[in-house]
């Protein structure tokens, strides 16, 4: 007789999740000499311990502390790039601008990027059928709590000028409910961070509006200013050209506005 299983609204755990996490860990530690000391089998043990056998709506940041400890990593605090609703371009940027880092360029972010996972209360099984949806089921699910935890730590580590890439094609360019708006903004440390510089990425080729005047950007500026951090904003009118100019800054066309 099959066991009754909780049916959640979100997709189930990514297939071959343990193997994927382990393989990513191996790849990352091979590429990054400073993380060579990391035992990927221990990293997986800490990861599994955070969510397996636990109710997937009752996960806490504390559950992830052993994993956070094993994944402790120092990135240059003045080279941090945050992003909201524009992950692909942010990652393309740091792949070119190798001295800057998104969360997904760190070990823990790299391990979990684009993956879904959850367990079941009181069984040592991974639930591949369904996992809680943040809106429809619960916010304290394994994936959401993981990203909240690593995002908070990443923002806390930032210093000097912090950059954030925002999607100018969205109705809310700055969304208070995004991870950036709800976690990272509030965990930048005013005693370490001098300026938050927003890069608003335009979607349409003919879009010449100054999106830095958007009401949601003004809202972000207000939140940041109240936290005693300076705010600046730039329009990136041509993201394709922007990336090209990061690759080849000497190009003659790169002196004009992008």
């Amino acid at each position: 007789v099959p066991r009754w299983r909780q049916q959640w609204s979100g997709p189930g755990t990514t297939k071959r999740f343990p193997e994927t996490v382990l393989a990513r860990c191996v790849k990352y530690t091979e590429i990054h000499p400073e993380m060579r000391h990391v035992d990927c089998q221990s990293v997986w043990d800490a990861f599994k311990g955070a969510f397996i056998s636990k109710h997937p709506c009752n996960i806490t940041e504390e559950d992830y502390q052993p994993l956070m400890k094993l994944g402790t990593q120092t990135v240059p605090c003045n080279k941090i790039l945050l992003w909201s609703r524009i992950k692909d371009l942010a990652h393309q940027f740091t792949q070119v601008q190798r001295d800057m880092f998104t969360l997904e360029d760190t070990l823990l972010g790299y391990l979990a990027d684009d993956l879904t996972w959850c367990g079941e209360f009181n069984t040592s099984k991974i639930n591949y059928q369904s996992c809680p949806d943040w809106r429809k089921d619960c916010s304290n699910n394994p994936v959401s709590v993981f990203w909240k935890t690593v995002s908070r730590r990443f923002a806390e580590a930032a210093c000097d000028v912090v950059h954030v890439m925002l999607n100018g094609s969205r109705s809310k360019i700055f969304d208070k409910n995004s991870t950036f708006g709800s976690v990272e903004v509030h965990n930048l440390q005013p005693e370490k961070v001098q300026t938050l510089e927003a890069w608003v990425i335009h979607g349409g080729r003919e879009d010449s509006r100054d999106l830095c005047q958007d009401p949601t950007i003004k809202e972000l500026e207000s939140i940041i200013s109240k936290r005693n951090i300076q705010f600046s904003c730039k329009n990136i009118y041509r993201p394709d050209k922007f990336l090209q100019c990061v690759k080849n800054p000497e190009d003659s066309s790169c002196t004009s506005e992008i």
Epitope: P18, S42, D45, K48, G49, S53, T123
Partner: antibody
């Protein structure tokens, strides 16, 4: 039926090395991890290390680091444990044991054991 | 490393007796605990995993309980073939560690 068949007994001199093999049959070799556990005469069980053949990675107990090498050959479905700089205290039965890659379960299958005697 | 402490180290019991063996971890291991049975000159055999789940093919007289740091293996009615040494083992973190064993002997 799953079987883990280990190599035969060995007698070794102090300072030398021993390499024990564990051939798996009856299951998908690359879907599992293989640990090595030893048992000195009249003593309890001691975990030495673990290899994941699919990923080619291994770890080991700190006690054995620098002395133990755990490897696997996917083409022959065989796991290996090599212990160097042998001393008399290494005299023991060495077992290989299988668990799932995700380590969500126990060592569900064990080899028959290989007696390694270290004596001058 | 996580230390696993079993008690008693040995016990004498009769066929039909209820036998309880305890295992204590030096730090919390959730339910990442297995129990093994080992007979002389044989490899260990898995009985219980995840603290209380019975391994396939293992008689239902064996049961496990506990979580965190304190665990119990119970044999509800000891049978002649149950006289052996029993080990607990944690698989919460590396290195994997075993209890020192409990030898169940005939009274």
């Amino acid at each position: 039926e799953v079987q883990l068949v280990q190599s035969g007994a060995e007698v070794k001199k102090p300072g030398s090395s021993v390499k024990v093999s564990c051939k798996a049959s009856g299951g998908t070799f690359s879907s599992y991890a293989f640990s090595w556990v030893r048992q000195a005469p009249g003593q309890g069980l001691e975990w030495m290390g673990r290899v994941i053949p699919q990923l080619g990675i291994a770890n080991s107990a700190q006690k054995f680091q620098g002395r133990v090498t755990i490897t696997a050959d996917k083409s022959t479905s065989t796991a290996y444990m090599e212990l160097s700089s042998l001393r008399s205290e290494d005299t023991a039965v060495y077992y290989c044991a299988r668990d799932d890659i995700a380590a969500l379960g126990p060592f569900d299958y064990w080899g028959q054991g290989t007696l390694v005697t270290v004596s001058s | 490393d996580i230390q696993m402490t079993q008690s008693p180290s040995s016990l004498s019991a009769s066929v039909g007796d209820r036998v309880t063996i305890t295992c204590r971890a030096s730090q919390g291991i959730s339910s990442w605990l297995a129990w093994y049975q080992q007979k002389p000159e044989k490899a260990p055999k898995s009985l219980i995993y995840a603290a209380s789940s019975l391994q396939s093919g293992v008689p239902s007289r064996f049961s496990g309980s506990g979580s965190g740091t304190d665990f119990t293996l119970t044999i509800s009615s000891l049978q002649p073939e149950d006289f052996a040494t029993y080990y607990c083992q944690q698989y919460n973190s590396y290195p994997r560690t075993f209890g020192q064993g409990t030898k169940v002997e005939i009274k």
